[in-house]
Amino acid sequence: RPSFSLVEDTTLEPEEPPTKYQISQPEVYVAAPGESLEVRCLLKDAAVISWTKDGVHLGPNNRTVLIGEYLQIKGATPRDSGLYACTASRTVDSETWYFMVNVTDAISSGDDEDDTDGAEDFVSENSNNKRAPYWTNTEKMEKRLHAVPAANTVKFRCPAGGNPMPTMRWLKNGKEFKQEHRIGGYKVRNQHWSLIMESVVPSDKGNYTCVVENEYGSINHTYHLDVVERSPHRPILQAGLPANASTVVGGDVEFVCKVYSDAQPHIQWIKHVEKNGSKYGPDGLPYLKVLKAAGVNTTDKEIEVLYIRNVTFEDAGEYTCLAGNSIGISFHSAWLTVLPAPGREKEITASPDYLE
C-alpha cells in the first residue's frame, strides 16, 4: 500500500499544510545526559518571547526554566533533543530564531542507525567550530520504505548540517547513481538536500542512499522505493448498482452489486431496519441488519446478487451493498418498494435492466 494516498480523503484533508521548518542549518547545542543547558534567544528588541519545541508550545516545569531571553534545561535527557524556537513578538511583527538541541552521549557513526549526533561539550556552532555531518531531523527519516504509484514523482530528502557544509551524493543499490541509469535522468537540489525522480516506473524500484560528507566525517541514509503499477484502492462499485426495484407482495426481487477490487474484497448485503419505531440509535447511527455476507462456501458471483423471495411489506426499505478490502470501504444503496397485490394474482413489475 502506498505510504500516501495520491488524493486525500476530503474528510481527512487538513485545511492548512503542516508547519515546515525552513532552516538549512540552525544553531546546534549539544549536551550529555544529566548536564544542564542554557540557551539565549538571539533576537534583538525582544519584548515578549515565547518558546516552542518541535512546534509545540514550551512552558516552564521542574526541569525547564524560562527567564527573559534565556532557556535553561536542568538535567538534560535525550528526550530534550529536538528543534527549538524562540519567537519575539513586537507591535508590528514577529521574528523567530531556531536552534537544535542534541542530548547524547554517543559518537555518531558512519550510518544513522543509532540516531545520535555526536558528543561534544555543548557549544553554539559557528565558523570556528568544525563539525562532522549530522542529520537535522532523524525522526523525519525514520520511514524508509516508500511505495509510489507508477507515473508519479518521488522526492527523497536527507537534510544535514556540518561545518564545513557537507556535500551530498546519491547511490542506487549501493552503486553510484548516474543520470543515464534511468530514462529522463533525475534532478538534485543540493540546497534542499533532495533527489527527484519524475514519472517513476517499475525499474526505479530499489534502495536509494544519500551520502553526506565533509572532511570530518561521512553519514548515509537509505530509502527503499517500491513502484506500484496500479494504485491500491478501496473497492469500486459499478455505477447505478444496485438499482431501485419494486414488486408486489408475494413477488420475488433481486438486487445486483458489481464489485471491482485488486485486493480481496469482503462483501455484505445490509438492510436498514427500525427498532422501537426508529431508524437511528441514540448515537445517531442507523440500525442495520446483515442479510448476506461472503462465507467459506460463497462465490463472488453468489454474493453479488441478493435475492428476496415471497416479498412482504416488511421487506420494503433501503438495501446496501457494502464492500471492503484492506484499503477501505465502499457502499451503494437502493430502495425496494412493495406494492399491494391486485386480487390474488402475483404480478411483478418489470425488473430493471442491470446491464449497462
Epitope: 502506498p2 505510504s3 500516501f4 494516498s5 495520491l6 488524493v7 486525500e8 480523503d9 476530503t10 484533508e13 487538513p14 485545511e15 492548512e16 499544510p17 503542516p18 508547519t19 515546515k20 525552513q22 523525519k140 527519516m141 520511514k143 516508500h146 509510489v148 504509484p149 507508477a150 507515473a151 508519479n152 514523482t153 518521488v154 522526492k155 527523497f156 530528502r157 536527507c158 537534510p159 537540489r189 534542499h192 533532495s194 527527484i196 514519472s199 530509502y223 506500484v228 503499477e229 496500479r230 494504485s231 491500491p232 484502492h233 478501496r234 469500486i236 484499503i327 477501505g328 465502499s330
Partner: antibody, heavy 127, light 107 residues
Framework: EVQLVESGGGLVQPGGSLRLSCAAS????????ISWVRQAPGKGLEWVGR????????NYADSVKGRFTISADTSKNTAYLQMNSLRAEDTAVYYC????????????????????WGQGTLVTVSS | DIQMTQSPSSLSASVGDRVTITCRAS??????LAWYKQKPGKAPKLLIY???FLYSGVPSRFSGSGSGTDFTLTISSLQPEDFATYYC?????????FGQGTKVEIK
C-alpha cells in the same frame, strides 16, 4: 503522447445541469488523477476539484461542493464533471488536467501538479 | 484558504530582458509551488514544480526559487513566445489555489 479532450460544454439556464467529459489517452489512467480547473471570462484560474483515478476518491473547492461531482469510467479512460444547480457565476471555460503526485518522503505530504491540460470547454449559465 | 498574491499584476518588457515575477503565500507552503504560463485562448502550461524544478521540455531560461511563503519566477532572457500570463499555484493546502496572474506584455 498524452492527450486530454473535453466535451459537453454549452448554454444552460440557472439551476440547470450539465455533464462535462474528459477523454484521456497516452498515460496509465489509474495511476494518476484528473483535476478540473475553470476560468471565468477575463479572469484567472480557479481549481474546481480533483479525482484520483485509482481509488475514485475526490476533493472539491468549497464553491462547488455539494453541487459538482467528479467521477471516472476507467474502462473508457474518461473523467466526468457533473454540474448541478448551476449559477451565473459558474460561467467559465472548464479545463481538465492530468494530475500527478510528488511524494515528499521527508515531510510526508503530496504535492499535486497538473502537467497536461485539455483545450477547455465553455459553459455559459444564463437565462 | 491559502491566498496567493502575485506581483506585479502586469509588466511591459522587451525581448532579451530579464523578468522577475514574485508570488507570496498567506501561509507556509514549503516548496509546494508550481508556475504555469497561459496564452490567450489556450490552456495553461506547466513550467516549474516544487518551487524550483524545471518541468521536462521547458526552456532553461525559466527558473524558480523560494520556499515557505516567498517565491520567484525568473525569465533570464525574454523571448517573443514568452509574452503571456503567468500564474503561481500552491499545491499542498486544500483547496489548491492560484495567484491572480501576471501579464507580461511587449514594451
Amino acid at each position: 503522447e498524452v492527450q486530454l479532450v473535453e466535451s459537453g460544454g454549452g448554454l444552460v439556464q440557472p439551476g440547470g445541469s450539465l455533464r462535462l467529459s474528459c477523454a484521456a489517452s497516452g498515460f496509465p489512467f489509474t495511476s494518476t488523477g484528473i483535476s478540473w480547473v475553470r476560468q471565468a471570462p477575463g479572469k484567472g484560474l480557479e481549481w474546481v476539484g480533483r479525482t484520483h483515478l485509482g481509488d475514485g476518491s475526490t476533493n472539491y473547492a468549497d464553491s462547488v461542493k455539494g453541487r459538482f461531482t467528479i467521477s471516472a469510467d476507467t474502462s473508457k479512460n474518461t473523467a466526468y464533471l457533473q454540474m448541478n444547480s448551476l449559477r451565473a457565476e459558474d460561467t467559465a471555460v472548464y479545463y481538465c488536467a492530468r494530475t500527478y503526485g510528488i511524494y515528499d518522503t521527508y515531510d510526508m505530504y503530496t504535492e499535486y501538479v497538473m502537467d497536461y491540460w485539455g483545450q477547455g470547454t465553455l459553459v455559459t449559465v444564463s437565462s | 484558504d491559502i491566498q496567493m498574491t502575485q506581483s506585479p499584476s502586469s509588466l511591459s518588457a522587451s525581448v532579451g530582458d530579464r523578468v522577475t515575477i514574485t508570488c507570496r503565500a498567506s501561509q507556509d507552503v514549503d516548496t509546494s509551488l508550481a508556475w504555469y504560463k497561459q496564452k490567450p485562448g489556450k490552456a495553461p502550461k506547466l513550467l516549474i514544480y516544487s518551487a524550483s524544478f524545471l518541468y521536462s521540455g521547458v526552456p532553461s531560461r525559466f527558473s524558480g526559487s523560494g520556499s515557505g511563503t516567498d517565491f520567484t519566477l525568473t525569465i533570464s532572457s525574454l523571448q517573443p513566445e514568452d509574452f503571456a500570463t503567468y500564474y503561481c499555484q500552491q499545491s499542498t493546502g486544500h483547496p489548491q489555489t492560484f495567484g491572480q496572474g501576471t501579464k507580461v506584455e511587449i514594451k
